[in-house]
Interface confidence: medium
């Protein structure tokens, strides 16, 4: 199986592709803002699962699915009450993933 650092690197590359592409992502669709530090990749996947018909994030969803399946989903501390653009969400996810990649633990 692929190591966690390699999967994180793959996710960083994919998210970097998305964040730098200037085309409006998923036609400006909104998703729930979630606490990534508390819920990790599983809550990110939950939030993005609500987006359909958006080819640009299919690969991200697939990578997140793999990362989430590595362990049981973490309980989110509180229900999300804010919606943000998918592009903004992806930017936050990228920052979180980079931080995890730099500092581990693996």
């Amino acid at each position: 199986s692929v190591s966690l650092p390699l999967t994180l690197k793959e996710l960083i590359e994919e998210l970097s592709n998305i964040t730098q592409d200037q085309t409006p992502l998923c036609n400006g669709s909104m998703v729930w803002s979630v606490d990534l530090a508390a819920g990790g990749f599983c809550v990110a996947l939950d939030s993005l699962t609500n987006i359909s018909n958006c080819n640009a994030i299919y690969r991200t969803q697939r990578i997140l699915h793999g990362l989430c399946n590595r362990k049981a989903p973490t309980t989110v501390s509180s229900l999300p009450d804010t919606k943000i653009e998918v592009a903004h969400f992806i930017t936050k996810l990228l920052s979180y993933t980079k931080q995890l990649f730099r500092h581990g633990p693996f």
């Epitope: 590359e13 970097s16 592709n17 964040t19 730098q20 592409d21 200037q22 085309t23 409006p24 992502l25 036609n27 400006g28 669709s29 909104m30 653009e85 592009a87 903004h88 992806i90 930017t91 936050k92 920052s95």
Partner: antibody, heavy 123, light 110 residues
Amino acid sequence: QIQLVQSGPELKKPGESVKISCKASGYTFTDYAMHWVKQAPGKGLKWMAWINTYTGKPTYADDFKGRFVFSLEASASTATLQISNLKNEDTATYFCARAGRTEGTHYYAMDAWGQGTSVTVSS
Amino acid sequence: DIVLTQSPVLAVSLGQRATISCRASQSVSISSSDLMHWYQQRPGHQPKLLIYRTSNLVSGIPARFSGSGSGTDFTLTIDPVQADDIAAYYCQQGRESPWTFGGGTKLELK
């Protein structure tokens, strides 16, 4: 502060090549896409291409496929534009401009520009 | 491609209001905003972002600049016009690639 510094003016003959550089400072280079924009003398702005500074992959406008190569020297925080087989109609000022969806920037807009590099093609 | 149309020249008097228009050949809207931006280019200088997403003023840009519009019709307003506002103004759409600019409107003094 954010700065994009471009290489100096160029005078070339038709058929020659030119390489223009754009050195970025004051921000994380690989977090922001880089665009190139052409402005012919007395004319308006024309978008040429953008390059993903993380992967190095360029996306071209149709009019700038073929003789134009957009590349990176990411370790030096530098984007480059090379034009081969120069023609008279390539005479213009070429600008680099950064853009991206990173928090703190203006989504989808070119928020920092280089000073421009003048390229004159004349026999 | 989305074509953006601007009037080439606008003559104004100092202290008056200048209204610069930009019309798109198709909508530049997405669900949450209108993706039209405005740039100022003084003679011999690089363009400078003034307004992004139709009406958001860039930090450090004077409040006499404002933007409005939706769909296909957009306006940049300068009120009152000052001497250092004499420049060319370009609209640019961020709705789809290829990114396109308007032909520019040159602001001139009456």
